[in-house]
């Protein structure tokens, strides 16, 4: 039975040209995290394998940095980066947990962070 929950940074906004940390946290389960995939819509941004470490997709290598932790840092943001991001936790023995983050990249210098929320 899957008992875990994923806490994410929720709906967030950031300035064009700036950077942002996408963060998810899996709690309420003793399952072992074997791999975390970060995806934007249908595109794979990065993989963090528990044993083998990080793989950043070549098309994002210049603008995506691993961490902190299992999170992902997006740099040199453009308005095209606006959209949904997913952290997909592959665990043993529970299975897969998915968290969703919506990022809005703003032209203005006012970029407020949204509240944290939980996805069961």
């Amino acid at each position: 039975m899957m008992t875990g929950t994923i806490e994410t940074t929720g709906n967030i906004s950031a300035e064009k040209g700036g950077s942002i940390i996408l963060q998810c946290h899996l709690s309420s389960t003793t399952a072992q995290v074997t791999q975390v995939n970060w995806e934007q819509q249908d595109q794979l941004l990065a993989i963090c394998n528990a044993d083998l470490g990080w793989h950043i997709s070549p098309s994002f290598k210049d603008r995506v940095a691993p961490g902190p932790g299992l999170g992902l840092t997006l740099q040199s943001l453009t308005v095209n980066d606006t959209g949904e991001y997913f952290c997909i936790y592959h665990t043993y023995p529970d299975g897969t947990y998915t968290g969703r983050i919506f990022l809005e990249v703003l032209e203005s210098s006012v970029a407020e962070h949204g509240a944290r929320f939980q996805i069961p």
Partner: antibody
Framework: QVQLVQSGAEVKKPGASVKVSCKAS????????MGWVRQAPGQGLEWMGI????????SYTQKFRGRVTMTRDTSTSTVYMELSSLRSEDTAVYYC????????????????WGQGTMVTVSS | EIVMTQSPATLSVSPGERATLSCRAS??????LAWYQQKPGQAPRHLIY???TRATGIPARFSGSGSGTEFTLTISSLQSEDFAVYYC?????????FGGGTKVEIK
């Protein structure tokens, strides 16, 4: 041309260990991860794990953790797979297979395979 | 782990006919899917990667399609050397997993 040459067939008793070797040639050994796959008689293919020949880092399937050890010797371009506490269900052909992509474990299908090593576990 | 299911288990086809093999993933693997061919007593041979791209030297009669959870390998006109077992495999989530295989036999 890329070649993966594996060690010869082995017959082992239950409880023993076996160490299978896979010698690579025809490419830069440390640039490609190596996977191990096994196939029991008349059965399908089963993923066992992977090793990064450059760093020595490994990732094993949960089923084999605690029983399998994958190592490499960069001086001879050889990877090894050792399986301990053998039981009759471990009777299978063991294959090493190279991951296609250079310098990463993704996205990497298995492009070259060794000829296989038959391991028979019998009392 | 991601479970890969192949169907049918056995496919009986006459030489020159078309063969269609299916592979289903228990969750999306995007296009991170490979197909392999294995003949008796031999190691698997890589045919297709990225769900639809033929490996070097693979004849054009082999084609792959699909994305997400549903995939197909089509052999447009079966030659005598194509009778073998075919396996699909996902390579997005460890442990990488194979389907149970489809045996293509002579009708």
């Amino acid at each position: 041309q890329v070649q993966l040459v594996q060690s010869g067939a082995e017959v082992k008793k239950p409880g023993a260990s076996v160490k299978v070797s896979c010698k690579a040639s025809g490419y830069t050994f440390t640039s490609h991860y190596m996977g191990w796959v096994r196939q029991a008689p008349g059965q399908g293919l089963e993923w066992m794990g992977i090793i990064n020949p450059s760093m020595g880092a490994t990732s094993y399937t949960q089923k084999f953790r605690g029983r399998v050890t994958m190592t490499r010797d960069t001086s001879t371009s050889t990877v090894y797979m050792e399986l301990s506490s053998l039981r009759s269900e471990d009777t299978a052909v063991y294959y090493c297979a190279r991951l296609h992509v250079s310098g990463s474990y993704y996205p990497a299908y298995l492009d070259y395979w060794g000829q296989g090593t038959m391991v028979t576990v019998s009392s | 782990e991601i479970v890969m299911t192949q169907s049918p288990a056995t496919l009986s086809v006459s030489p020159g006919e078309r063969a269609t093999l299916s592979c289903r993933a228990s969750q999306s693997v995007s296009s991170n899917l490979a197909w392999y061919q294995q003949k008796p007593g031999q190691a698997p041979r890589h045919l297709i990667y990225g769900a639809s791209t033929r490996a070097t030297g693979i004849p054009a009669r082999f084609s792959g399609s699909g994305s997400g959870t549903e995939f197909t390998l089509t052999i447009s006109s079966l030659q005598s050397e194509d009778f073998a077992v075919y396996y699909c495999q996902q390579y997005i989530v460890f442990p990488w997993t194979f389907g149970g295989g489809t045996k293509v036999e002579i009708k």
